[in-house]
């Protein structure tokens, strides 16, 4: 008589029984391992920096203007400075350098601190240009804006950028820009390869 509920005949060799007894914990272990592995992978994905996922992004605030004869604006970024950050791109002497090829949204706003509508027109031309300034072989203007009657300009555009491109923001004219973080800022966002 077979033992009740054993599922194994006493007279037969218990291969099926042994196999079943071994397979059940093995399958259970594999399932648990799979669940744990998926959870850990998901956590690892969440903890990965944005740049490793391809989402290179930077938002910068004005640090200072250049010395005489240097029209460039010098930028700074980082959590300690407030609402500015760099994930992927980096700053090289206050200029933004791209680390990943792709199409980027480039945006900028600049407000002049010493300015009125009459000043802006009187001190014409005051212009802001954003461009690739190095390497020299890729040098090109990406954005050009003029302060005609106002004290603030803002613009954005999509443009392809390559690893190693350094973006420069040139402010020409005699009007001092504001360093207020809600008035003057510059950033890029990777959109697609």
């Amino acid at each position: 008589m077979p033992e009740e509920g054993s599922g194994c005949s006493v007279r037969r060799r218990p291969y099926g029984c042994v196999l079943r007894a071994a397979l059940v914990p093995l399958v259970a272990g594999l399932v648990i391992c799979l669940v744990v592995c998926i959870q850990r992978f998901a956590q690892a994905q969440q903890q990965l920096p944005l740049e490793s996922l391809g989402w290179d992004v930077a938002e910068l605030q004005l640090n200072h203007t250049g010395p005489q004869q240097d029209p460039r604006l010098y930028w700074q970024g980082g959590p300690a400075l407030g609402r500015s950050f760099l994930h992927g791109p980096e700053l090289d002497k206050g200029q933004l350098r791209i680390h990943r090829d792709g199409i980027y949204m480039v945006h900028i706003q600049v407000t002049l601190a010493i300015c009125s509508s009459t000043t802006a027109s009187r001190h014409h031309p005051t212009t802001l240009a954003v461009g690739i300034c190095s390497p020299a072989s890729r040098s090109i203007s990406l954005l050009r804006l003029s302060f005609h009657q106002g004290c603030t300009i803002a613009s954005q555009r999509l443009t392809p950028l390559a690893r190693g491109d350094t973006l420069c923001t040139n402010l020409t004219g005699t009007l001092l820009p504001s360093r207020n973080t809600d008035e003057t800022f510059f950033g890029v966002q990777w959109v697609r390869p």
Partner: antibody, heavy 120, light 109 residues
Framework: EVQLVESGGGLVKPGGSLRLSCAAS????????MNWVRQAPGKGLEWVSL????????YYADSVKGRFTVSRDNAKKSLYLLLNSLRAEDTAVYYC?????????????WGQGTLVTVSS | EIVLTQSPATLSLSPGERATLSCRAS???????LAWYQQKPGQPPRLLIF???SRATGIPDRFSGSGSGTDFTLTISRLEPEDFAVYYC??????????FGGGTKVEIK
């Protein structure tokens, strides 16, 4: 503690020259625009000049344009004002004043001032 | 050049009273970019208010600024003995002429 100390004032004849200095301490001098503001005896305040942190942007009041020259040495944390072709109406206490970090030209810290007297 | 006119030239009040000082610009001052300073005899000016209504660091809340366009006001809600001084408004919305008003003297009645 932010400190601004002016020096170089004194008695000078009309047409003469003088160089004022302002020694700064207690803050990152190279990050701030700096200004000169003057006050004639018993009168109100008159802004004279502004120089940006990197010296790229320099502004003067019309009354001193072409006669006064502002400069700074960030390494020495010093601000200067060279006064040429002095007139009797330039007689005043000259204050060195720090501009706001935002670059907006209002003056959050002032020195005690140095007196310039132009008289024959 | 923007001209700032302060009124009254002199304000005679007692401690505990409210002081209202006016500053009028000859043309609109950009986005309320106007400052107020206090000056006591033999001392340099002290920044009280910037951006027309923002109190500078360490300034007591009895000082308040308001206004926009061409009309601005400095209010001292309850005068303390140390508040008797000369007050100047300054505009910094135009360049290169950053101008001060002629001042209002707040004296003890």
């Amino acid at each position: 503690e932010v400190q601004l100390v002016e020096s170089g004032g004194g008695l000078v004849k009309p047409g003469g020259s003088l160089r004022l200095s302002c020694a700064a301490s207690g803050f990152t001098f190279s990050s701030y625009s700096m200004n000169w503001v003057r006050q004639a005896p018993g009168k109100g305040l008159e802004w004279v000049s502004l120089i940006s942190s990197s010296s790229r942007f320099i502004y003067y009041a019309d009354s001193v344009k072409g006669r006064f020259t502002v400069s700074r040495d960030n390494a020495k944390k010093s601000l200067y004002l060279l006064l040429n072709s002095l007139r009797a109406e330039d007689t005043a206490v000259y204050y060195c004043a720090r501009g706001d970090y935002s670059n907006y030209p209002y003056f959050d810290y002032w020195g005690q001032g140095t007196l310039v007297t132009v008289s024959s | 050049e923007i001209v700032l006119t302060q009124s009254p030239a002199t304000l005679s009040l007692s401690p505990g009273e409210r002081a209202t000082l006016s500053c009028r610009a000859s043309q609109s001052v950009r986005s309320s970019y106007l400052a107020w300073y206090q000056q006591k005899p033999g001392q340099p000016p002290r920044l009280l208010i910037f951006g027309a209504s923002s109190r500078a660091t360490g300034i007591p809340d009895r000082f308040s600024g308001s206004g926009s366009g061409t009309d601005f006001t400095l209010t001292i809600s309850r005068l303390e003995p140390e508040d008797f001084a000369v007050y100047y408004c300054q505009q910094y919305g135009d360049s290169p002429a950053l101008t001060f008003g002629g001042g209002t003297k707040v004296e003890i009645k």
